[in-house]
């Protein structure tokens, strides 16, 4: 739980309060809302970020067609329960005792129920499809330049290992970024694709979570890449369980 020692701030999470009262008098940064100490050398988990957000004063195809099991986060913001490691608890409930099961990115994957609802395990989201539409430009971006720039972004800004960026698809004006990360592939210390996708989503919306950094300035060969729409699909290792009523 280290932070920048010089002025005791958290470079990777502005939604923290930092104080030199950690072990050995070292700087310790706590996430707003939960008070949990965060590791400022990497991304903070989406669960703790959502909790902090709630406490603080979205023809021939080379594009991927999301599977029928893909989830979109339609429920919006909620104040989540996080486990001691900062991950989402499998079962989430609101103040009126309405409960539902979520996946590892906190997206609802069952119908809503009452307090008797059981969520046996936290189901991992192993495939995330980020669907972007960019603003009109003079011409299309070069696909390989775009691919290289987005991979660099995920590697350098979000510290996501390159092997987890499975593909970048482009069909003007739509860009799709595929992130894949199975449970077996994720080693200790690896950034979670769900956390990287959330930081990216907030960056794209102009709501950067990084401390003191300017907003995201995406450029491909000097040409600004301005996103006007974002849609994120989440695919779980186990398909979601919704009643037919919801599907119709």
């Amino acid at each position: 739980h280290t932070a920048a020692q010089d002025n005791c701030t958290c470079p990777t999470n502005k939604m923290t309060v930092c104080s030199p009262d950690g072990p050995g008098g070292r700087c310790q940064c706590r996430a707003l809302g939960s008070g949990m100490a965060v590791d400022c050398s990497t991304l903070t988990s989406k669960c703790l970020l959502l909790k902090a957000r709630m406490s603080a004063p979205k023809n021939a195809r080379t594009l991927v067609r999301p599977s029928e099991h893909a989830l979109v986060d339609n429920d919006g913001l909620y104040d989540p329960d996080c486990d001691p490691e900062g991950r989402f608890k499998a079962r989430q409930c609101n103040q009126t005792s309405v409960c539902w099961c979520v996946n590892s990115v906190g997206v609802r994957r069952t119908d809503k129920g009452d307090l008797s609802l059981r969520c046996d395990e936290l189901v991992r989201t192993h495939h995330i499809l980020i669907d972007l539409r960019h603003r009109p430009t003079a011409g299309a971006f070069n696909h390989s330049d775009l691919d290289a720039e987005l991979r660099r972004l995920f590697r350098e800004r979000y510290r996501l290992h390159p092997k987890f960026v499975a593909a970048v698809h482009y069909e003007q004006p739509t860009i799709q970024i595929e992130l894949r990360q199975n449970t077996s592939q994720k080693a200790a210390g690896d950034v979670d694709i769900g956390d990287a996708a959330y930081y990216f989503e907030r960056d794209i919306k102009g709501e950067s979570l990084f401390q003191g950094r300017g907003g995201l300035d995406l450029r491909v060969r000097g040409e600004p890449l301005q996103v006007e729409r974002t849609l994120i699909y989440y695919l779980d290792e186990i398909p979601p369980k919704f009643s037919m009523k919801r599907l119709t």
């Epitope: 005791c8 309060v17 104080s19 030199p20 009262d21 950690g22 072990p23 310790q28 706590r30 707003l32 939960s34 008070g35 949990m36 100490a37 001691p84």
Partner: antibody, heavy 115, light 107 residues
Framework: QVQLVQSGAEVKKPGASVKVSCKAS????????INWVRQAPGQGLEWMGN????????NYNQKFKDRVTMTRDTSTSTVYMELSSLRSEDTAVYYC????????WGQGTLVTVSS | EIVLTQSPATLSLSPGERATLSCRAS??????IHWYQQKPGQAPRLLIY???ESISGIPARFSGSGSGTDFTLTISSLEPEDFAVYYC?????????FGQGTKLEIK
């Protein structure tokens, strides 16, 4: 040396409010959390909440959320804890304490609620 | 919230003996546990922080250990002034919580 000095004892009637102060010295006031802890007669310690003096971010124990307010005055390095709608069960010694590991404590302020 | 359970509630020992006080957390909290001593009419005093880190000015006979959910405060050889109430406290997440205390009394 680090010191936290609290205001004197108070006697209040049920339904009233009390405001206890905690003046800090000997360290950078804005860099450390100040917590409030209370102890009813013969009982254990109970955390009420804390405030980060740098930006006034405060955080309250759900039990006191509707009745407690913590504020600070950086010009005098003083933190205040106000508890409203007092009842007899609020009779206790109220302490301020610094940081996450409560390394320095005030001397305590006895608040007696009695009709 | 995280519940801390201290045991035993009362410990009766003689000066010179070794005291072992336990604190168990309802969920894993790493090493975010702190130990305090309180004597009648006084404010608590920090003895050990972050499970095992010593505090300057606190006698070396006080030591702490543990991580996760189980923590121990050990007083290697009791002195007459050590008889008091001892509390553990967690700072893993808000709300911070205290154990109910262990009273260390003279046998």
């Amino acid at each position: 040396q680090v010191q936290l000095v609290q205001s004197g004892a108070e006697v209040k009637k049920p339904g009233a409010s009390v405001k206890v102060s905690c003046k800090a010295s000997g360290y950078t006031f804005t860099s450390y959390w100040i917590n409030w802890v209370r102890q009813a007669p013969g009982q254990g310690l109970e955390w009420m909440g804390n405030i980060y003096p740098s930006d006034s971010y405060s955080n309250y124990n759900q039990k006191f959320k509707d009745r407690v307010t913590m504020t600070r005055d950086t010009s005098t390095s003083t933190v205040y804890m106000e508890l409203s709608s007092l009842r007899s069960e609020d009779t206790a010694v109220y302490y301020c304490a610094r940081g996450s590991s409560f390394d320095y404590w005030g001397q305590g302020t006895l608040v007696t609620v009695s009709s | 919230e995280i519940v801390l359970t201290q045991s035993p509630a009362t410990l009766s020992l003689s000066p010179g003996e070794r005291a072992t006080l336990s604190c168990r957390a309802s969920q894993t909290i790493g090493t975010s546990i702190h130990w305090y001593q309180q004597k009648p009419g006084q404010a608590p005093r920090l003895l050990i922080y972050y499970a095992s880190e010593s505090i300057s000015g606190i006698p070396a006979r006080f030591s702490g250990s543990g991580s996760g959910t189980d923590f121990t405060l050990t007083i290697s050889s009791l002195e007459p002034e050590d008889f008091a109430v001892y509390y553990c406290q967690q700072s893993n997440s808000w709300p911070f919580t205290f154990g109910q205390g262990t009273k260390l009394e003279i046998k």
